[in-house]
């Protein structure tokens, strides 16, 4: 094969090619969360396993202090699943003046932090009312989409209530990203 | 274009390049499951359509006997959706000594089987309590993530109750994987 | 690096290589929907933001009139999340002659339209019964999978009830596709 055979017939100029195997990638899995202070109106961030079991980071994609650090600019597919579990939410039974009360809910947010930008950016949100009847409950929220990220961006997963996160199995709650 | 123009400026040595179009890929769609006995404590595996309609396998990714066979080592994105449907779950109505009973649930697991390893590995799990009130119910569980797989690994989708799987439409229940 | 070094040892002939950065990609985000007529038995299509905030289209992937237009043939990963919200569905409380009535439901369909083919093709469907008790409710449906598409194919997202779609935040309801 000669180099020029890689050029498609319409002679479009491409950016430099690179092997797929060296692209930044990470799949992080749940660990038991340590109790931490977080501000009342701010969803706490989960921390993650990055090297044991199914978890890995590779090709300069690093995990540190609840953040995935983006090592190069480009379009990334980012995903997470958080499995929640809890005791019965009695929201259906408690009514004030005969009208339904505000439902309990569970929420996952994948957030981007850019040091040069004051506010974090919410990339993805999955939010669900929980108004279960008659027993304990458990359910996952899954998110995934593509975003244009810059070198140095940091990604984290925030949840509405850290105490409801199922941390028991690495296949139930996870977080990942890969350069496309 | 000359071959050396593919080399990025920082002269990093890359693995051999390859065209994206020749990477192993598969998208499998639901079929009606054949009556089979399965062990009480083991989730049965679904079998799939691999060539009709929206389904396909390509580039040495083969489907056989409920398994997707991984033809080369690398990082794969793996996904599945299973739509469940059922008649009312009565868990909210039956109480023992006034306390809620264990809820019914629906579960999907994407499992990896490696011949050299005695136990299957659960890669992904979506599990949800089902405690519906007053009517038929239906709902999907979606899963997707990236894993490092080895040539010869086999992937399957297991469900908690095969009789609850909606097999009626190829867009409701599906399973796929592709090399990144 | 010489061009022939890209040829793997088994001498397989690959399709032309191309840089990942020039592949067609889009991530669209929710906007408030304008009231439009749609046929009674046909799910209405959502329209989308394609350039503000997190939304983008690139490399000849264009958005026009509710459709993503596929600019070149290949295997694409397609995804969408729609967050629904509504007032209590009373389906569990209204019974006819002691039997539960048909449940309310929410449905998302990712549809492909091919001009040369008379009928749209449903690629992905997420459908869920909604039989909530005692309060307002909200919940997402997420879909994603890989499909072989042809140049000129058009993709859209249809929903069962446009008035239930949460259009308030770009991270809650979105639609995207990228060439693998």
């Amino acid at each position: 094969l000669k180099g020029q055979e890689f050029a498609p017939s319409h002679q479009q100029v491409y950016a430099p090619l690179r092997a797929d195997g060296d692209k930044p990638r990470a799949h992080l899995t749940v660990v038991r969360q340590t109790p931490t202070q977080h501000f009342k109106n701010q969803f706490p961030a989960l921390h993650w396993e990055h090297e044991l079991g199914l978890a890995f980071t590779k090709n300069r994609m690093n995990y540190t202090n609840k953040f995935l650090l983006i090592p190069e600019s480009g379009d990334y597919f980012i995903y997470s699943q958080v499995t929640f579990r809890g005791m019965t939410s009695e929201c259906s039974e408690i009514r004030q003046a005969g009208r339904p009360n505000k439902p309990d809910s569970i929420t996952v947010v994948i957030t981007k932090v850019t040091d040069s930008y004051p506010e974090p950016t919410q990339l993805l949100m999955g939010t669900k009312s929980v108004c279960e009847v008659g027993s304990n409950w458990f359910q996952p929220i899954y998110l995934g989409a593509m975003f244009s990220l810059q070198e140095g961006d940091k990604l984290m997963v925030n949840v509405s209530d850290i105490s409801l996160v199922d941390y028991t199995k690495e296949d139930k709650t996870f977080f990942g990203a890969f350069l496309l | 274009l000359k071959g050396q123009e593919f080399a990025p400026s920082h002269q990093q040595v890359y693995a051999p390049l390859r065209a994206d179009g020749d990477k192993p890929r598969a998208h499998l769609t639901v079929v009606r499951q054949t009556p089979t006995q399965h062990f009480k404590n083991q989730f049965p595996a679904l079998h799939w359509e691999h060539e009709l309609g929206l389904a396909f396998t390509k580039n040495r990714m083969n489907y056989t006997n409920k398994f997707l066979l991984i033809p080369e080592s690398g990082d794969y994105f793996i996904y599945s959706q299973v739509t469940f449907r059922g008649m009312t779950s009565e868990c909210s109505e039956i109480r023992q000594a006034g306390r809620p009973n264990k809820p019914d649930s629906i579960t999907v697991v994407i499992t990896k089987v490696t011949d050299s390893y005695p136990e299957p590995t659960q890669l992904l799990m979506g599990t949800k309590s089902v405690c519906e009130v007053g009517s038929n119910w239906f709902q999907p569980i979606y899963l997707g993530a990236m894993f490092s797989l080895q040539e010869g690994d086999k992937l399957m989708v297991n469900v908690s109750d095969i009789s609850l799987v909606d097999y009626t439409k190829e867009d409701k229940t599906f399973f796929g994987a592709f090399l990144l | 690096l010489k061009g022939q070094e890209f040829a793997p040892s088994h001498q397989q002939v690959y399709a032309p290589l191309r840089a990942d950065g020039d592949k067609p990609r889009a991530h669209l985000t929710v906007v408030r929907q304008t009231p439009t007529q749609h046929f009674k038995n046909q799910f209405p299509a959502l329209h989308w933001e394609h350039e503000l905030g997190l939304a983008f289209t690139k490399n000849r992937m264009n958005y026009t009139n509710k459709f993503l237009l596929i600019p070149e043939s290949g295997d694409y990963f397609i995804y969408s999340q729609v967050t629904f919200r509504g007032m209590t569905s009373e389906c569990s409380e209204i019974r006819q002659a002691g039997r539960p009535n048909k449940p309310d439901s929410i449905t998302v369909v990712i549809t492909k339209v091919t001009d040369s083919y008379p009928e749209p093709t449903q690629l992905l469907m997420g459908t869920k019964s909604v039989c909530e008790v005692g309060s307002n409710w909200f919940q997402p449906i997420y879909l994603g999978a890989m499909f072989s598409l042809q140049e000129g194919d058009k993709l859209m997202v249809n929903v069962s009830d446009i008035s239930l779609v949460d259009y308030t935040k770009e991270d809650k309801t979105f639609f995207g596709a990228f060439l693998l």
């Epitope: - | 079929v31 009606r32 499951q33 054949t34 009556p35 089979t36 006995q37 399965h38 359509e49 009709l52 449907r85 059922g86 008649m87 038929n136 109750d161 095969i162 009789s163 609850l164 799987v165 009626t168 | 039997r99 539960p100």
Partner: antibody
């Protein structure tokens, strides 16, 4: 309107095979699974299996596995059920039935085909 | 092996109400698709009366209704008519996806 018309009565010897046909009309043949159900004289209904005419996929009741084969000819919108190694207890009326996809109930039935197995 | 059990026979006078029960030996019967009911009049093929416990196909009179309680399903016929005489079968699926029929119930309309 939907119709399933079955082939006529058959008399077979023990050990032989029988092939019963079921011609569908009034709907898209490939869009609905066909089931086969039999009823021995004076007895109840017994399910034998299902056939997807589009893919050719089948599912058989354990009792009949290895002896029954269900096939479809899409060009003629006809489903077939072949039962081999016949014995006297296979004497029955054999019905084809079209399914409701959502519930797998048997919505439309053929008129039945009497198969008598006698030496 | 799962079983659906029906009473062998029931009877009632014209205008009366009769109920036929169908009890499952296993909790997973009907979980996915519910229980269906069929009417077989003498010398004819079965006819679908009720699907998914409750639902009447078009053309089935509203004298026929289905219900469910626990692991049992029931078919109720009100305003019994002489032409209702025949056999009635319940049907569902077990956890292995095999279809099961009940043994059938012979309905006799007295008088």
């Amino acid at each position: 309107q939907v119709q399933l018309v079955q082939s006529g009565a058959e008399v077979k010897k023990p050990g032989a095979s029988v092939k019963v046909s079921c011609k569908a009309s009034g709907y898209t043949f490939t869009s609905y699974d066909i089931n086969w159900v039999r009823q021995a004289p004076g007895q109840g209904l017994e399910w034998m299996g299902w056939l997807n005419p589009n893919s050719g996929n089948t599912g058989y009741a354990q009792k009949f596995q290895g002896r029954v084969t269900m096939t479809a000819d899409r060009s003629t919108s006809t489903a077939y059920m072949e039962l081999s190694s016949l014995r006297s207890e296979d004497t029955a009326v054999y019905y084809c039935a079209r399914e409701v996809p959502e519930t797998a109930a048997f919505e439309y039935w053929g008129q039945g085909t009497l198969v008598t197995v006698s030496s | 092996q799962s079983v659906l059990t029906q009473p062998p026979s029931v009877s009632g006078a014209p205008g009366q109400r009769v109920t036929i029960s169908c009890t499952s030996s296993s909790s997973d019967i009907g979980a996915g698709s519910g229980v269906h009911w069929y009417q077989q009049l003498p010398g004819t093929a079965p006819k679908l009366l009720i699907e998914g416990y409750y639902n009447r196909p078009s053309g089935v009179p509203d004298r026929f209704s289905g219900s469910k309680s626990g692991t049992s399903a029931s078919l109720t016929i009100t305003g019994l008519l002489p032409e209702d005489e025949g056999d009635y079968y319940c049907q569902s699926y077990d956890g292995t996806l095999s279809a099961l029929f009940g043994g059938g119930t012979k309905l006799t309309v007295l008088g």
